[in-house]
Each structure stands twice: as C-alpha cells, then as structure tokens.
Amino acid sequence: CDLPQTHSLGNRRALILLAQMGRISPFSCLKDRHDFGLPQEEFDGNQFQKTQAISVLHEMIQQTFNLFSTEDSSAAWEQSLLEKFSTELYQQLNNLEACVIQEVGMEETPLMNEDSILAVRKYFQRITLYLTEKKYSPCAWEVVRAEIMRSLSFSTNLQKILRRKD
C-alpha cells in the first residue's frame, strides 16, 4: 500500500497547526518539563516490515487524536485551530486505516507488532497521567504540545523511510 503524498503534506500541516496552537511562552513552563520517554526505536523504519510500521504510525496518530479530542483539550486550545488540527489527524487516520486494511487482507496470518503498539500506548499513558497530575494546567498542556510536535516529527521521518521502501 502506498501512502499518498498528501499524507505527508497533512502531517506537515498538522505540525504547523500544532505550532500555531501555542498560547504561552515555553520558557515560562521550564519547571514543568518532563521526559515522557518517546519510544524512538519504534520509529526506526528498518526495524520491521512496512505493514507493521504502518500499524505503529496508526496507533501514534490515533492516540494523538484521542488526546486532543477530550473536553480538557477543548478548554485548553483555540477552537478553530484545534478543529483544523483534529481534521488533519482524522484524514491521516483514514489514509493509514485504508493501508492497514489492505495489508491485513493480503496476509495469511496478520502479524501484529504487539510490543511496538504497547510501547506507543504506554507513552501516551505517561502523557495522560502527567496531565492528570498537573490538573490540566496551561503549562502542562504546553509541555504536552511540545512533546506531541516531537513525536509527530518522528512519525514524519518514519513515513519518509516507508516511501523509500516502496
């Protein structure tokens, strides 16, 4: 399955929107910085098959979408930017979903990279718990916004590797 070029453009648009969503200076939130342990090895496109990599990408985007679809998120961000950002993610999910469905149909026994999926899930669990502990403060959301920009950048790199594999 070939991810359309528009998918990468969508990812870049999502990054731009996320950058625009920043409301407060990151420098005023230095005390709230946190290492969420982004599972960078899961974004090494050479580590596993393309099908599995797409599943990891899907999980990453799906968890990001869910994170920014909460009531707490709606209260934290400018509504029109948040809606545009969510729309970009939703479109990416559609693209990835179509790819995974196509690959699943072609496989005898669909291989699931369980540990990679779990690593992504645990990463977002840490983010969720951080927000809860910080009571969804503006600085906590700013730290999370910066972290998601970082993770989306990694997923962009993974997509580039996948396109080279075609």
Epitope: S55, N66, V100, R126, L129
Partner: antibody, heavy 119, light 108 residues
Framework: QVQLVQSGAEVKKPGASVKVSCKAS????????MHWVRQAPGQGLEWMGE????????IYAQKFQGRVTMTRDTSTSTVYMELSSLRSEDTAVYYC????????????WGQGTLVTVSS | EIVLTQSPATLSLSPGERATLSCSAG???????LYWYQQKPGQAPRLLIY???NLASGIPARFSGSGSGTDFTLTISSLEPEDFAVYYC?????????FGQGTKLEIK
C-alpha cells in the same frame, strides 16, 4: 454516555463454535481498542485479546491463538468474538471492555454473555 | 506472562474496619499500568483505581492504592456495607494482560 451491549446467553455442544457480539454507542467506535475478558463460574478474570475497530488488527493471548477470532462491523459499531472447538472449560461469562488510557482503561464493560458448553 | 498473586484469598472483616489487600507480581510491573477492579455477584467489574494510586471517577476517598515494582496494595480505610465484594488487581504492562485471582472481602 458510553454503552456496550452484548448478545444473549448461548448453550453450545463441545466441538461447536460460538459468536458473541458487543454493540458500542456513546463514543467514536473506531478510536478505541475493544478487549474481551472471560470469567468461568466462581473463577477470576482472564484476558483473551483485543481488536482495533478502526482497521481490524487483533492481538490475542497465546492461550486462545488459533481458536479465537475477533472481528468488527464499523457500520453497526459492533465487535464480535468467535471461539471455536468449544470444550466444557470454556463455560464462562464473556465480557467486552473498552480500552483507553488513564482512567478510561476498562472503565466501560458490557453486561456479559454466559456461554454454556454442555453435551 | 506476568502472574499476579493476590492475598489473602478471603478477608473477613466488619463494617468500619480497615481492609488491606495485596497483589504480588511475578515480575516487575510499571506502576502506571497496575489497576484495581471491584466485582459484585452478577455484575461486570468496576474500575476502582488506575495507575496504582489514582482514584477512578465516583470512587469514594476511603479507597486508596500504593506500591511499585512487584508489590501493590489496595486499602479501604473504613469498610462500608457496600464494599463487600471481590477485588481484582490487573496489569497491562506486558502481553498477555493478566488479572490476579481475586480477594473476596466478606462480612465477618
């Protein structure tokens, strides 16, 4: 509000198959993995596996690999769990439970479906 | 597979007393992925505590959780009549996800 409604009780003969359904409502169906957990009479809880309703990918517990099949129908927001080659030890209440993160993990359960395997 | 062993299997106490339930993991579990559930006869399990020590929505403050690594504890500070049920610990730190065998909390 989030609701998971399961199909009714089933009685099956050893060697047969059973297919239990779980209809979701009150949230975006495709966004959350759905899990299946079973409980034999008077026993504890046992995780069977999970399915991503978005694309249908599954992760099964090794114990059930080869005997369980989880599927979904996005048009009706329903997930299915089929267990084949039934034996008496499979007599249990089968639950679907929605995944999520933090306080949302297994915060929502179906009402349970009793499957009785008897000759 | 991470085996979760709960103790005691049955705990007989009176309303107003303090209950301490233990959950021991066969190998280390990330505290973020250790949960506790309550189950009453004929009902589905109900989420009590998530990530070792966080109270789920609507759960009274008499419930608390603690622990790390391989040893986790659920404490009920002063038992109410509605607290008598079966309690399960659960981990999703690694596949396959597992539950403890349960602790039945019964009225003395």
């Amino acid at each position: 509000q989030v609701q998971l409604v399961q199909s009714g009780a089933e009685v099956k003969k050893p060697g047969a198959s059973v297919k239990v359904s779980c209809k979701a409502s009150g949230y975006t169906f495709r966004n959350y993995w759905m899990h299946w957990v079973r409980q034999a009479p008077g026993q504890g809880l046992e995780w069977m596996g999970e399915i991503n309703p978005s694309h249908g990918r599954t992760i099964y517990a090794q114990k059930f690999q080869g005997r369980v099949t989880m599927t979904r129908d996005t048009s009706t927001s329903t997930v299915y769990m089929e267990l084949s080659s039934l034996r008496s030890e499979d007599t249990a209440v089968y639950y679907c439970a929605r995944g999520g993160l933090g306080p949302a993990w297994f915060a929502y359960w179906g009402q349970g479906t009793l499957v009785t395997v008897s000759s | 597979e991470i085996v979760l062993t709960q103790s005691p299997a049955t705990l007989s106490l009176s309303p107003g007393e303090r209950a301490t339930l233990s959950c021991s993991a066969g190998s280390s579990v990330d505290s973020s992925e250790l949960y506790w559930y309550q189950q009453k006869p004929g009902q589905a399990p109900r989420l009590l505590i998530y990530s070792t020590s966080n109270l789920a929505s609507g759960i009274p403050a008499r419930f608390s959780g603690s622990g790390s690594g391989t040893d986790f504890t659920l404490t009920i500070s002063s038992l109410e009549p509605e607290d008598f049920a079966v309690y399960y610990c659960h981990q999703w730190s690694s596949y396959p996800f597992t539950f403890g065998q349960g602790t039945k909390l019964e009225i003395k």
